[in-house]
């Protein structure tokens, strides 16, 4: 029998390489059974995760999974950092792994690097 616990499917030590000025959707895949939990996003500041208030968020439903989406419209250089989603379920808080946004400020780049070039940046690969 499948568990009816809420599960948040963000991979540990995952990351996204994105560009300032672009729109971006950060998805938190949520599995639940009967009642959709309340889900929030926060941004890590050291060891504290600061809840993101007043941000554009939305839900997307797929057949076995729902996605709680944090919208960046557009991405700003200050959006660089690690994010976590959490679900409030039966008075318990379930936290996802954090996922990191690496923001490239296109103003400081002479031209947009390709995804392969992004992937070769040593502070992404080796940190």
């Amino acid at each position: 029998k499948e568990s009816c616990d809420v599960q948040l499917y963000i991979k540990r030590q995952s990351y996204h390489s994105i560009f300032a000025g672009d729109p971006f959707k950060l998805e938190c895949p949520v599995k639940y059974c009967a009642h959709r939990p309340q889900v929030t996003w926060c941004k890590l500041n050291g060891t504290t995760c600061v809840k993101l208030e007043g941000r554009h968020t939305s839900w997307k439903q797929e057949k076995n999974l729902s996605f709680f989406i944090l919208h960046f419209e557009p991405v700003l250089p200050s959006d660089n950092g690690s994010y976590r989603c959490s679900a409030n379920f039966l008075s318990a808080i379930i936290e996802s792994h954090s996922t990191t946004l690496y923001v490239t400020d296109v103003k400081s780049a002479s031209e947009r690097p390709s995804k392969d070039e992004m992937a070769s940046r040593p502070w992404l690969l080796y940190s």
Epitope: Q7, K11, R12, Y15, H16, S17, L44, Y126
Partner: antibody
Framework: QVQLQESGPGLVKPSGTLSLTCAAS????????MYWVRQPPGKGLEWIGR????????RYNPSFKSRATISADKSKNQASLKLSSVTAADTAVYYC????????????WGQGTLVTVSS | DIVMTQSPDSLAVSLGERATINCKSS???????????LNWLQQKPGQSPKRLIY???KLDSGVPDRFSGSGSGTDFTLTISSVQAEDLAVYYC?????????FGQGTKLEIK
């Protein structure tokens, strides 16, 4: 259950490129991380790097500098390793492995393939 | 890089006896999520490695309960409470906290 099968040439010439493929069954690789480890004959294990097949993002061991390239094909449920500019020191058994990216609930290694670098 | 150092390099144990393998990391393996990503692998002769233990002390499914893991921070131990003939293998610790992932040099378990 989760299974992995590595394939590729067992002999590569010095300065050439080693190319290996790892086919997964019993799991959708987009829910995993896939990684490569090598073991020179009679020696210990060395981590080469890993890929998130969901988005193609990679992490590498800096000791491989820019020689290693890991890629994944979600439609074929497989990952690949390319190692360029090989020398005799790259002779090893190469293992691919896969683990649950969310909860670490499984970690499975392939059977390994011996690659010899020699002219 | 985190350096993983195992001790001893090899040990010979009689059937039914306890075997203890130590693993020390050059820095703490406690991650920011409060978990410690320390794994133990078993590699039997001529075979590929198999994960025995993850998150310091969690046993993989199908692993006999004579195997146990313990420790925290930088010091970890794999214990086999009653060694069996099929436990003849090389055992590796490895860390999954920081990149690049790193392995101990291995400990060869022999049967007396």
């Amino acid at each position: 259950q989760v299974q992995l099968q590595e394939s590729g040439p067992g002999l590569v010439k010095p300065s050439g490129t080693l190319s290996l493929t790892c086919a997964a069954s019993g799991v959708n690789i987009k829910d995993t991380y896939m990684y490569w480890v090598r073991q020179p004959p009679g020696k210990g294990l060395e981590w080469i790097g890993r890929i998130d097949p969901a988005n193609g993002y990679t992490r590498y061991n800096p000791s491989f500098k820019s020689r290693a390239t890991i890629s994944a094909d979600k439609s074929k449920n497989q990952a690949s390793l390319k190692l360029s500019s090989v020398t005799a020191a790259d002779t090893a058994v190469y293992y691919c492995a896969v683990y649950d990216g969310y909860y670490e609930s499984f970690d499975v290694w392939g059977q390994g393939t011996l690659v010899t670098v020699s002219s | 890089d985190i350096v993983m150092t195992q001790s001893p390099d090899s040990l010979a144990v009689s059937l039914g006896e306890r075997a203890t393998i130590n693993c020390k990391s050059s820095q703490s393996l406690l991650d920011s999520d409060g978990k410690t990503y320390l794994n133990w692998l078993q590699q039997k002769p001529g075979q590929s490695p198999k994960r025995l233990i993850y998150l310091v002390s969690k046993l993989d499914s199908g692993v006999p309960d004579r195997f146990s893991g313990s420790g925290s921070g930088t010091d970890f131990t794999l214990t086999i409470s009653s060694v069996q003939a099929e436990d003849l293998a090389v055992y590796y610790c490895w860390q999954g906290t920081l990149f690049p992932r790193t392995f101990g040099q291995g400990t060869k378990l022999e049967i007396k």
